[in-house]
């Protein structure tokens, strides 16, 4: 059996069949003789008891209040009362989008990774026995699928699969034709699994400097969102007042990874800054990667092969 309507705030589109089912249904069957009442209140109207005479569009049976169909003026608060049990819903009926096969407010978005399993299944368990046929549309164009009772797509996702998929169930009630639409916005993305972070450039960098001048050491990496990039130098980081770590800069790549750079600024370079390792490390769940910078006096450049220099 279809479960109850538990969400207290419900938005529905005008012109579609709709139902409210209270959540003490099993209990209600046990006490058949108990008075069960449905009420509506909206704006100035206080609680008005609902019954089939209230409107030809309203049907009451067992635990359910049905609308055939729901219309804009059905907006309001609804109450089910039985003995000391009360359940309340706030119903908001919105206008149908006349220019589309679906209404944007009624969309369920899902993000699927390319090559991963992707499925759309058109089912409606409550109205199942009344459904004549069901059609599946992609971007409001009907898809030709074998099963016209429960159309289904099951495949490995490709980028071309991206789009709005609308399941439209057609059903008859009291000689009238109705339809119910359920729409999914499917976005196909690149593989989101984590990469092994990598520091860009050579692992060892000799930087030619002049005493008394400033230098900026730039450390860049391709990494995951949660990975960290940091500098290590000297006995204790921060002991040299001339050394400053600048704020990390991050730019997201089209693949959803991050390009990060962190600058170490050394001001008023002294002898103590020469020939020591300034290490930049990227750390992730999968381990770490480190690259090193060594400051060398410009006069000593001739002793080091040119290809190891970072200008």
């Amino acid at each position: 059996a279809e479960s109850c309507t538990s969400r207290p705030h419900i938005t529905v589109v005008e012109g579609e069949p709709f139902y409210l089912k209270h959540c003490s249904c099993s209990l209600a069957h046990e006490i058949e003789t108990t008075t069960k009442s449905w009420y509506k209140s909206s704006g100035s109207q206080e609680h008005v008891e609902l019954n089939p005479r209230s409107s030809s569009r309203i049907a009451l049976h067992d635990c359910v209040l049905e609308f055939w169909p729901v219309e804009l003026n059905d907006t309001g608060s609804y109450f089910f009362q039985m003995k000391n049990y009360t359940q309340k819903w706030k119903l908001n009926v919105i206008r149908r989008n006349k220019h589309s096969c679906f209404t944007e407010r009624q969309v369920t978005s899902k993000i699927v990774e390319v090559k991963k399993f992707f499925q759309i299944t058109c089912e409606n368990s409550y109205y199942q026995t009344l459904v004549n046929s069901t059609s599946l549309y992609k971007n409001c164009k009907k898809l030709l699928l074998e099963n016209n009772k429960n159309p289904t797509i099951k495949k490995n996702a490709e980028f071309e699969d991206q789009g709005y998929y609308s399941c439209v169930h057609f059903l008859h009630h009291n000689g009238k034709l109705f339809n119910i639409t359920k729409t999914f916005n499917i976005t196909i993305v690149e593989d989101r699994s984590n990469i092994v972070p990598v520091l860009l450039g050579p692992k060892l960098n000799h930087v030619a400097v002049e005493l008394g001048k400033n230098v900026r050491l730039n450390c860049s990496a391709l990494l995951n969102e949660e990975d960290v990039i940091y500098w290590m130098f000297g006995e204790e980081n921060g002991s040299d007042p001339n050394i400053h770590e600048e704020k990390e800069m991050r730019i997201m790549t089209p693949e959803g990874k991050w390009h990060a750079s962190k600058v170490l600024r050394i001001e008023n370079i002294g002898e103590s800054n020469l020939n020591v390792l300034y290490n930049c490390t990227v750390a992730s769940t999968g381990g770490t990667d480190t690259k090193s910078f060594i400051l060398v006096r410009k006069a000593d450049m001739a002793d080091i092969p040119g290809h190891v220099f970072t200008r």
């Epitope: 969400r7 705030h9 938005t11 407010r105």
Partner: antibody
Framework: QVQLVQSGAEVKKPGASVKVSCKAS????????MHWVRQAPGQGLEWMGT????????YYNQKFQGRATMTVDTSTSTVYMELSSLRSEDTAVYYC??????????????WGQGTTVTVSS | DIQMTQSPSSLSASVGDRVTITCQAS??????????MHWYQQKPGKAPKLLIY???NLETGVPSRFSGSGSGTDFTFTISSLQPEDIATYYC?????????FGQGTKLEIK
């Protein structure tokens, strides 16, 4: 009326895994999405991911991709969240919470009581 | 991904004061007349509690002194007259797209 009941507190060693359960009662289990939100001590709320019980579709916050696994058992209206390769930063209160399936309705009106997970050597 | 920037991170106010918290999304969270922004209250040791949904709708049972407004990227949460029981941390949350995201929170204290 609607209730989400979570499993009890856990103490784990770094590198281990933890599996937290969340049982839903008295409501349309398969018409709502279930989410996991965590809160480290003294920190804010962090959305971890979601599962649609109707088809087991999952989507994870990139931060937890590959480490978190959300599953559902519709026969018992229970969702599970397993977090592997635990580290001390995973010490937090883990909440399950429910929302509607439409994008507009993905706000959290019912919450579990929270499960404290402590990661310590 | 949509980043949420909430301000201030903390604030101190007196009972009866009007309190305003803002939340800015890194891109629009509004579509066709709806804004997919929601507000929560969290007291120490408790689960968060929904106060406002879809930018301006008051959750059932929440006092009318709480309100929300805004559209696009800029949203405001207001307590018209601060009460002692309102001491808590407040969070905004967007549901325009996955991944869902929260603001970093605003801790509200009584002067």
């Amino acid at each position: 009326q609607v209730q989400l009941v979570q499993s009890g507190a856990e103490v784990k060693k770094p590198g281990a895994s933890v599996k937290v359960s969340c049982k839903a009662s008295d409501y349309t289990f398969t018409s709502n999405w279930m989410h996991w939100v965590r809160q480290a001590p003294g920190q804010g709320l962090e959305w971890m991911g979601t599962i649609d019980p109707s088809d087991s579709y999952t989507y994870y916050n990139q931060k937890f991709q590959g480490r978190a696994t959300m599953t559902v058992d519709t026969s018992t209206s229970t969702v599970y969240m397993e977090l592997s390769s635990l580290r001390s930063e995973d010490t937090a209160v883990y909440y399950c919470t429910t929302s509607g399936d439409y994008d507009a309705d993905r706000y959290f009106d019912v919450w579990g009581q929270g499960t404290t997970v402590t990661v310590s050597s | 991904d949509i980043q949420m920037t909430q301000s201030p991170s903390s604030l101190s106010a007196s009972v009866g004061d009007r309190v305003t918290i803002t939340c800015q999304a890194s891109k629009s969270v509004s579509t066709s007349g709806d804004s997919y922004m929601h507000w929560y209250q969290q007291k120490p040791g408790k689960a968060p509690k929904l106060l406002i949904y879809l930018a301006s709708n008051l959750e059932t049972g929440v006092p009318s002194r709480f309100s929300g407004s805004g559209s696009g990227t800029d949203f405001t949460f207001t307590i018209s007259s601060l009460q002692p029981e309102d001491i808590a941390t407040y969070y905004c949350q967007q549901s325009r797209e996955l991944p869902l995201s929260f603001g970093q929170g605003t801790k509200l204290e009584i002067k």
